[in-house]
């Protein structure tokens, strides 16, 4: 069982337990911050990020941000707390096992973002319309 002095941790956001006292392990996410990308006009892309990290806090999820402007294309992969906005946007899809890109309005660039909560799920980013959340099959996957 979990030692009592671990549960009485000062920094309680680092420890999340269920009713049986089991401690939640953080998400495993691709974490390369911002890198140049060749991902363009594809249904899905791999992140080409070789770094998988244990997220710092148990509540964090995996996030990917794809940006295109006149100069370049970048892909950002990070861990982030879904209770907090990222790039001024709420992570609406944090419970999804897949990282399904949704376009966000940003002046001067094309901006897509996704979030998800399965191992290294931000390694495979999906742009295809067939994965739109209006698809009942996807909702089944997400909420199973």
């Amino acid at each position: 069982t979990i030692p009592p002095h671990v549960q009485k941790s000062v920094n309680n956001d680092m420890i999340v337990t269920d009713n049986n006292g089991a401690v939640k392990f953080p998400q495993l996410c691709k974490f390369c911050d911002v890198r140049f990308s060749t991902c363009d006009n594809q249904k899905s892309c791999m992140s080409n990020c070789s770094i998988t990290s244990i997220c710092e806090k148990p509540q964090e999820v995996c996030v990917a941000v794809w940006r295109k402007n006149d100069e370049n294309i970048t892909l950002e992969t990070v861990c982030h707390d879904p209770k907090l906005p990222y790039h001024d946007f709420i992570l609406e899809d944090a419970a999804s096992p897949k990282c399904i890109m949704k376009e966000k309005k940003k002046p001067g660039e094309t901006f897509f973002m996704c979030s998800c909560s399965s191992d290294e799920c931000n390694d495979n980013i999906i742009f295809s319309e067939e994965y739109n959340t209006s698809n009942p099959d996807l909702l089944l996957v997400i909420f199973q």
Epitope: T1, G21, A22, K24, S117, S118
Partner: nanobody
Framework: EVQLLESGGGLVQPGGSLRLSCAAS????????MAWARQAPGKGLEWVSL????????YYADSVKGRFTISRDNSKNTLYLQMNSLRAEDTAVYYC?????????????????WGQGTLVTVSS
């Protein structure tokens, strides 16, 4: 009864090395992911490293990447943490922990059994 017993902690100078061991009993060791976590004095729990049941996949926190190596010997029911290039901020009680369920896939990892910990002090 599940038991996890850590050993190998102690006092080491900055830049030094230590190898922690965790002897497991009371469950089928090779079926379960195992992890190391640590708690520095007055701080929260920090997950350090995770290893898959068969030992082929390993993961690390950014703070220890490139310095720590997790491994396991399933024939000896033992988990290891090799710690190199130790820093003062690595000072903590180190715990090994067992994943609650053996299943993989889209399920939240939860760890239900913990050792009592071994103290690592990095100081000159």
């Amino acid at each position: 009864e599940v038991q996890l017993l850590e050993s190998g902690g102690g006092l080491v100078q900055p830049g030094g090395s230590l190898r922690l061991s965790c002897a497991a009993s009371g469950f089928t060791f090779f079926n379960y992911e195992m992890a190391w976590a640590r708690q520095a004095p007055g701080k929260g729990l920090e997950w350090v490293s995770l290893i898959s049941a068969e030992g082929t996949r390993t993961y690390y926190a950014d703070s220890v990447k490139g310095r720590f190596t997790i491994s396991r010997d399933n024939s000896k029911n033992t988990l290891y943490l090799q710690m190199n290039s130790l820093r003062a901020e690595d000072t903590a009680v180190y715990y090994c922990a067992k994943r609650r369920d053996a299943s993989m896939g889209h399920t939240t990892r939860r760890f239900d059994y913990w050792g009592q910990g071994t103290l690592v002090t990095v100081s000159s």
